[in-house]
């Protein structure tokens, strides 16, 4: 678990096809916000907006193992 928040700025402008994997970190003792961190296919990590409807949809599909999320 992270010992502090990792994300301050977030984006929702990401295409699901560019996402290799997703990590969803719930609120905890050390960070009072949900953080969604995507690892892109080029290896970079990026913070996604957990409240954006399209990100919620991507998260649901990715965690369900549906790689065709668009």
């Amino acid at each position: 678990a992270e010992l502090r928040c990792m994300c301050i700025k977030t984006t929702s402008g990401i295409h699901p096809k560019n996402i290799q994997s997703l990590e969803v970190i719930g609120k905890g003792t050390h960070c009072n916000q949900v953080e969604v961190i995507a690892t892109l296919k080029d290896g970079r990590k990026i913070c996604l907006d957990p409240d954006a409807p399209r990100i919620k949809k991507i998260v649901q599909k990715k965690l369900a193992g549906d790689e065709s999320a668009d």
């Epitope: 010992l3 502090r4 928040c5 990792m6 994300c7 301050i8 700025k9 977030t10 984006t11 050390h30 960070c31 009072n32 916000q33 953080e35 961190i37 970079r44 990590k45 990026i46 913070c47």
Partner: antibody, heavy 126, light 107 residues
Framework: QVQLVQSGAEVKKPGASVKVSCKAS????????IHWVRQAPGQGLEWMGN????????NYNEKFKSRVTMTRDTSTSTVYMELSSLRSEDTAVYYC???????????????????WGQGTLVTVSS | EIVLTQSPATLSLSPGERATLSCRAS??????LHWYQQKPGQAPRLLIY???RSVSGIPARFSGSGSGTDFTLTISSLEPEDFAVYYC?????????FGGGTKVEIK
């Protein structure tokens, strides 16, 4: 110019609350955490917590969790720290400070607080 | 919660001398250790961040080193304006913690 400007000194009675403001200008408000740090007379620095100007989510030092509330107003780039149930030991200078800048890319390499407000003296006395 | 221990508490030196300040963490904080200078009646000022990275506008005589749990701030040649209190601070994890400070005074 780039600055954090805090509200003026306050004198409060024990049991009361105080709300200190910190207005940011000259930089991208949403790229920096805003921290609150206090310093009792002749003592060291004590971290109270911080707030994300983006989400408004605040993280508090366990010591103050039941008494402190941090909020922000993005329209005026102002952050507020309210401390309730004041006691004499809360007499201190309260500073806001920024940490950043950060982008959309998470990192485990963190910046120090490179910009501080001028401080607000809060005196708690009956 | 991490504890940062600074030593010595007071350092008595003359202008032109070299100052070496120590900060020890109770557990590893990677390199997320920063150094601040504070003068009476003023807010702290960031000198060094992420152990050894320089801050714009800070004289080159200030340098930092270390990693993990042991860190050092070095002032290569003390100037009259360098006599102040120095704090280390970590933000590898929250709560952020500061050391108790080292006062550098004129001998």
């Amino acid at each position: 110019q780039v600055q954090l400007v805090q509200s003026g000194a306050e004198v409060k009675k024990p049991g009361a609350s105080v709300k200190v403001s910190c207005k940011a200008s000259g930089y991208e408000f949403t790229s920096y955490w805003i921290h609150w740090v206090r310093q009792a007379p002749g003592q060291g620095l004590e971290w109270m917590g911080n707030i994300s100007p983006n989400s408004g989510s605040a993280n508090y030092n366990e010591k103050f969790k039941s008494r402190v509330t941090m909020t922000r107003d993005t329209s005026t780039s102002t952050v507020y720290m309210e401390l309730s149930s004041l006691r004499s030991e809360d007499t201190a200078v309260y500073y806001c400070a920024r940490e950043g800048p950060y982008s959309y890319y998470p990192s485990r390499q963190y910046y120090g607080s490179d910009l501080w407000g001028q401080g607000t003296l809060v005196t708690v006395s009956s | 919660e991490i504890v940062l221990t600074q030593s010595p508490a007071t350092l008595s030196l003359s202008p032109g001398e070299r100052a070496t300040l120590s900060c020890r963490a109770s557990q590893s904080i990677s390199n997320n250790l920063h150094w601040y200078q504070q003068k009476p009646g003023q807010a702290p000022r960031l000198l060094i961040y992420y152990t050894s990275r320089s801050v714009s506008g800070i004289p080159a005589r200030f340098s930092g080193s270390g990693s993990g749990t042991d860190f050092t701030l070095t002032i290569s040649s003390l100037e009259p304006e360098d006599f102040a209190v120095y704090y280390c601070g970590q933000n590898n994890e929250w709560p952020e913690v500061f050391g108790g400070g080292t006062k550098v005074e004129i001998k």
